[in-house]
């Protein structure tokens, strides 16, 4: 058909009546309706409903709606349904993105790694390494790394300093009362059950779509740490698969503090004498990396001379 | 009132071509589609094409391409039709018509040696 | 393309009588149908376009109607001037093609 017309107060579209030979000038139907008659020298345009299945988005002068998209294919879920006005739109569930027009699972970052980039319904989650004062001790999707406990600020200090994987560990000097200092020679270490130590194999290998270049490749800040060990070593907190602790290490007179923050458990200890803690990082192989482009679902786009 | 006046009739040799006329009167000429129709003997009628001259839009048949060849002159409120390599399938009568409704007198086109 | 046929090809009756013709479609085509009317040695006359409205100046013993692929042309009381070539022309698709054409005789 001949070319549109603008108009400023109501669109108009150009028909030509076939029968006639002529170019008339006809008001466009609204949204969610076609001109089921066209306007004629004598008459206006007759605009129709949409029937069930089809739409129209803007003002038209086309003669038939267009059709819905298709159902929505699994695991797609429907975002805008198929009415009048409006198709229907399929998208991804929480927690998937879309990939090769279907939905997959968002990258979980793992453990040492945190969410740099939240996932959307058509992009993947990006980690990144924790960076210096920050780790991230549970494989996610959602979390970013978090900071280090700041012992200081609670006047306590660093028994074992944080990793990648770990929070510092805090602790304090209790008072001298031998009434409530346990034996020499023992420390209790009682373990929050929900923290369980990820055994990852130590190894080089960057995960998919997780920027090294982003990562800290030196060691973590040590916060300041109480000098002149006494007697005794830091329990090695990573050694075990379940969290099962030796608890008869030479460290004297320890106590710990649970803190819960969050969902999140951090311990802290109460130390009696001081002494200097060392701390490793471990690196983390990934649990998956995040796929690569973002291909859209067809959006089913009409173009009609006569629709805006 | 509305009227088409075409031009008198064409006597041509095949493989020479011919310009038929229609002159509009009684309406604005380019508010208006323009078409020709060819009605042969034996053959029925048969749509050619139509012109827009308000903006010089051109619709053919596939069967008319290359053989039909249509123009308008604002100026003098006249369509054109030029068949071109005439053979005697081309001798028929040719009418110009507003829409489909309105219909100029027609022009006997005779192809012959 | 769209074919039409029209029925009957031609018809005798009398003055005074009432006649349908009729055209059908290959496909549908809404209401976009024409009748025309050619009397011997001339041109063509429009009778009736989008299925039933009459053109100016034409007789009201004219009417058309029917819709989607089937269609018809009745003349009620037929006078001596209505005997002629009729012929129906679908415009709701290039190329536009007509009916074979029905011939109208005094009997």
């Known amino acids: 058909q001949p070319e549109q017309k603008a108009s400023n107060l109501i669109g108009t579209y150009r028909h030509v009546d076939r029968a006639t030979g002529q170019v008339l000038t006809c008001d466009k139907c609204p949204a969610g309706t076609y001109v089921s008659e066209h306007c004629t020298n004598t008459s206006l345009r007759v605009c129709s409903s949409c029937p069930v299945g089809t739409f129209t988005r803007h003002e038209n002068g086309i003669e038939k709606c267009h059709d819905c998209s298709q159902p929505c294919p699994w695991p797609m879920i429907e975002k805008l349904p198929c009415a009048a006005l409006t198709d229907r739109e399929c998208t991804c569930p929480p927690g998937m993105f879309q990939s090769n027009a279907t939905c997959a699972p968002h990258t979980v970052c793992p453990v040492g790694w945190g969410v740099r980039k939240k996932g959307t319904e058509t992009e993947d989650v990006r980690c990144k390494q924790c960076a210096r004062g920050t780790f991230s001790d549970v494989p996610s999707s959602v979390m970013k790394c978090k900071a280090y406990t700041d012992c200081l600020s609670q006047n306590l200090v660093v028994i074992k300093p944080g990793t990648k994987e770990t929070d510092n560990v805090c602790g304090t000097l209790p008072s001298f009362s031998s009434s409530t200092s346990p034996s020499p020679g023992t420390a209790i270490f009682p373990r929050p059950e929900h923290m369980e130590t990820h055994e990852v194999p130590s190894s080089t290998y960057v995960p998919k779509g997780m920027n090294s270049t982003e990562s800290n490749s030196s060691a973590s800040v040590r916060p300041k740490v109480l000098s002149s060990i006494q007697e005794g070593t830091v329990p090695d907190n990573t050694s075990s698969a379940r969290g099962k602790e030796d608890v008869n290490k030479t460290l004297p007179n320890l106590q710990v503090v649970n803190h819960q923050q969050g969902p999140h458990h951090r311990h802290i200890l109460k130390l009696l004498p001081s002494m200097e803690a060392t701390g490793g990082e471990k690196s983390s192989t990934p649990i998956k990396g995040p796929k690569r482009g973002h291909p859209r679902q067809n959006l089913h786009k009409h173009f009609d001379i006569n629709e805006h | 009132q509305v009227q088409l006046q075409q031009s008198g009739t064409e006597l041509a040799r095949p493989g020479a071509s011919v310009k038929l006329s229609c002159k509009a009167s009684?309406?604005?000429?380019?508010?208006?589609?323009l078409n020709w129709m060819k009605q042969g003997t034996g053959q029925g009628l048969e749509w050619i094409g139509e012109?827009?001259?308000?903006?010089?839009?051109?619709y053919y048949n596939e069967k008319f391409k290359g053989k039909a060849t249509l123009t308008a002159d604002k100026s003098s409120n006249t369509a054109f039709m030029q068949l071109s390599s005439l053979t005697s399938e081309d001798s028929a009568v040719y009418f110009c018509?507003?829409?489909?409704?309105?219909w100029g007198q027609g022009t006997l086109v005779t192809v012959s040696l | 393309d769209i074919l039409m046929t029209q029925s009957p090809p031609s018809m005798s009756v009398s003055l005074g009588d009432t006649v349908s013709i009729t055209c059908h479609a290959s496909q549908g085509i809404s209401s976009n149908i024409g009748w025309l009317q050619q009397k011997p040695g001339k041109s063509f006359k429009g009778l009736i376009y989008h299925g039933s409205t009459l053109e100016d100046g034409v007789p009201s013993r004219f009417s058309g109607s029917g819709s989607g692929a089937e269609f018809s042309l009745t003349i009620s009381s037929l006078e001596s001037e209505d005997f002629a070539d009729y012929y129906c022309v679908q415009y709701a698709q290039f190329p536009y093609t007509f009916g074979g054409g029905t011939k109208l005789e005094i009997k």
């Open positions: 018509t507003r829409g489909v409704i309105k």
């Open positions: 009684g309406y604005t000429f380019t508010d208006y589609y």
């Open positions: 012109i827009y001259p308000g903006g010089d839009h051109t």
